[in-house]
């Protein structure tokens, strides 16, 4: 090994990665809100829709104060990976009725992938475990009908909206602890 020499700074550090994750999450939240509104306009929802394969909401307002960085990032990554899988499934199996929303779903998927990469980089830089907790992956079969795919889309976008909403709050809170 040669004499000690400094390294130039790379493009970002963990705190900048966290800032970037917050911006990406906010942007994705806005996209999801807009797409959910488009869905409601085109295919009015008759009440709330749910999908058994979607992750349960990780946080509530009451638990925000006790959040720990590793837990939040791990859970957020796992949940977003699940939503990514569901968005991919919607694009693949959604049928003709959802084809009109294909550009928006494609953009949503790309943003989701970008946010996941940023979270992963942050977890690598902090040296936090990246293994997803062992959860059974529920196989996603084709929707039973055209209406089934529309209800699934409502459920996916609604759940993603709630997840991103708590994610923004959680990440902003964690910024003060890093």
């Amino acid at each position: 090994p040669g004499p000690p020499a400094g390294s130039p700074r790379v493009s970002s550090d963990p705190r900048a990665d966290l800032d970037s994750a917050v911006l990406l999450t906010r942007s994705l939240l806005a996209d999801t809100r807009q797409l959910a509104a488009q869905m409601r306009d085109k295919f009015p929802a008759d009440g709330d829709h749910s999908l058994d394969s979607l992750p349960t909401l990780a946080m509530s307002a009451g638990t925000l104060g006790s959040l720990q960085l590793p837990g939040v990032l791990t859970r957020l990554r796992v949940d977003l990976m699940s939503y990514l899988r569901h968005v991919q499934w919607l694009r693949r199996a959604g049928g003709p009725s959802l084809k009109t929303l294909e550009p928006e779903l494609g953009a949503l998927q790309a943003r989701l992938e970008r946010l996941l990469r940023r979270l992963q980089l942050l977890m690598s830089r902090l040296a936090l475990p990246q293994a997803a907790p062992d959860q059974p992956v529920i196989p996603l079969g084709p929707p039973a009908s055209a209406w089934g795919s529309i209800r699934a889309a409502h459920a996916i976008l609604g759940g993603l909206h709630l997840t991103l909403d708590w994610a923004v709050r959680g990440l902003l809170l964690l910024k003060t602890r890093l």
Epitope: G6, S7, R9, V10, D13, P14, R15, P70, M81, L116, R117, Q120, L121, S124, R125, L126, A127, L128, P129, Q130, A131, A132, L178
Partner: antibody, heavy 114, light 111 residues
């Protein structure tokens, strides 16, 4: 400019111990996970151990598990590697690295030989 | 035996484009985990060249680019120069180890 400066390497007999240190400067040490990576003479890079930014997570390669201990002191911006029960196959340049790793030190040579 | 597989050597003439491959498994690259590339010039410490599959740290020329697909990744160097002669390593976090794994390294020779 980021600097990582390793020290504590040297010649040690099989079964002996050494403690490596890595002094960090030029970046927020307490925000980065830190690694030890080694390179045997003429060989490739081998990850040894990692410690999370706050010291709450520590992981080791199977080849050193139970013999090496990683630790950090964020108040001193310093990373440590306590190496016990050293073997000839532990002979290598030991690099301290930060983040992905994004930054690397210049390394310190550990030679295990009788 | 390295967890990530790289060709031991690669070569090219100045100005050429060379590609170095890196193959992993379902617990690292195939698990969707990012790939990073390092350059190690003779007698020096490794230097980060590409992170998160295709992002370049500041100061790294755009002649260097990375890509990833499935369980594999690759590093491309265009407009090859004599100063690119070095060892190149890929790395990725591994879920089963909870730490990074490295490829065996590829020695690049500029002819």
């Amino acid at each position: 400019e980021v600097q990582l400066l390793e020290s504590g390497g040297g010649l040690v007999q099989p079964g002996g111990s050494l403690r490596l240190s890595c002094a960090a400067s030029g970046f927020t040490f307490s925000s980065y996970g830190m690694h030890w990576v080694r390179q045997a003479p003429g060989k490739g890079l081998e990850w040894v151990s990692v410690i999370s930014y706050d010291g709450s997570y520590k992981y080791y390669a199977d080849s050193v598990k139970g013999r090496f201990t990683i630790s950090r002191d964020n108040s001193k911006n310093t990373l440590y590697l306590q190496m016990n029960s050293l073997r000839a196959e532990d002979t290598a340049v030991y690099y301290c690295a930060a983040g992905v790793p994004d930054y690397w030190g210049q390394g310190t040579l550990v030679t295990v030989s009788s | 035996q390295s967890v990530l597989t790289q060709p031991p050597s690669a070569s090219g003439t100045p100005g050429q484009r060379v590609t170095i491959s890196c193959t992993g498994s379902s617990s690292n690259i195939g698990a969707g985990l990012d790939v990073h590339w390092y350059q190690q010039l003779p007698g020096t410490a490794p230097k980060l060249l590409i992170y998160s599959n295709n992002e370049r740290p500041s100061g790294v020329p755009d002649r260097f680019s990375g890509s990833k697909s499935g369980t594999s990744a690759s590093l491309a160097i265009s407009g090859l120069r004599s100063e690119d002669e070095a060892d190149y390593y890929c790395a990725a976090w591994d879920d089963s180890l909870n730490g990074p794994v490295f490829g065996g390294g590829t020695k690049l020779t500029v002819l």
